[in-house]
Amino acid sequence: HSDGIFTDSYSRYRKQMAVKKYLAAVLGKRYKQRVKNK
């Protein structure tokens, strides 16, 4: 179903963005890129 494909794709994109910020902070010490509290 196309909705499911879109949801999976967005979820994967969202995870990759979050992981990029995480890696920058924990393996790159780029603290300015930390995720702020909601």
Partner: antibody, heavy 109, light 109 residues
């Protein structure tokens, strides 16, 4: 600043188990918290992390097998349905530069 | 998912000597976010190097990291008895998070 894991024990396969990481002097609104495990005599295995906003992300092999959540001073790792392959020392780390001593989980029937 | 392969293991050298550990990734490490950890028996890992070549605060300058892309190296010069440990590389993988190498044991003669 310190990190300490607790909750590790002997459990039978399929019995859910929650490990707790208690932090002191660390603002969980400013750091990522990571869970890593190490089977006896083996290497390190990254499980996942939780961000400042409380969103958790997992290695693909760990998704569905583990759940990471947090309060203001603790970070929990729930092993949803342990198998013998989950026998390991579980480490919690602030970012990846401040680690606890780990807590041992043994899964056996 | 990236697979990190460490060579050689174990590696042995005399006090005052130099040890080189290689870490090869099956795919390019995201952002060159490659770290090196030291782990002694019964202890948690300790961060030595981050972003391939940057020395963590408090770590002796005898430890150095280099490399980019898929090939990385940890060099320990003026080897000390206290350096006897297992060393792990850990690389950034945007689909998986963090991938650890299998570890390299350093034996000091």
């Amino acid at each position: 600043q310190s990190v300490e894991e607790s909750g590790g024990r002997l459990v039978t396969p399929g019995t859910p188990l929650t490990l707790t990481c208690t932090v002191s002097g660390i603002d969980l609104n400013s750091y990522y918290m990571t869970w890593v495990r190490q089977a006896p005599g083996k290497g390190l295995e990254w499980i996942g992390f939780i961000d400042a906003g409380g969103d958790a992300y997992y290695a693909s092999w760990a998704k569905g097998r583990f759940t990471i959540s947090k309060t203001s001073t603790t970070v929990d790792l729930k092993i949803t349905s342990p198998t013998t392959e989950d026998t390991a020392t579980y480490f919690c780390a602030r970012d990846l530069d401040l680690w606890g001593q780990g807590t041992l989980v043994t899964v056996s029937s | 998912a990236a697979v990190l392969t460490q060579t050689p293991s174990p590696v042995s050298a005399a006090v005052g000597g130099t040890v080189t550990i290689n870490c090869q990734s099956s795919e390019s490490v995201y952002g060159n976010y490659l770290a090196w950890f030291q782990q002694k028996p019964g202890q948690p890992p300790k961060l030595l190097i981050y972003e391939a070549s940057k020395l963590e605060s408090g770590v002796p300058s005898r430890f150095s990291g280099s490399g980019s892309g898929t090939q990385f190296t940890l060099t320990i010069s003026d080897l000390q008895c206290d350096d006897a440990a297992t060393y792990y590389c850990a690389g950034g993988d945007i689909s998986e998070g963090v991938a650890f190498g299998g570890g390299t044991e350093v034996v000091v003669k």
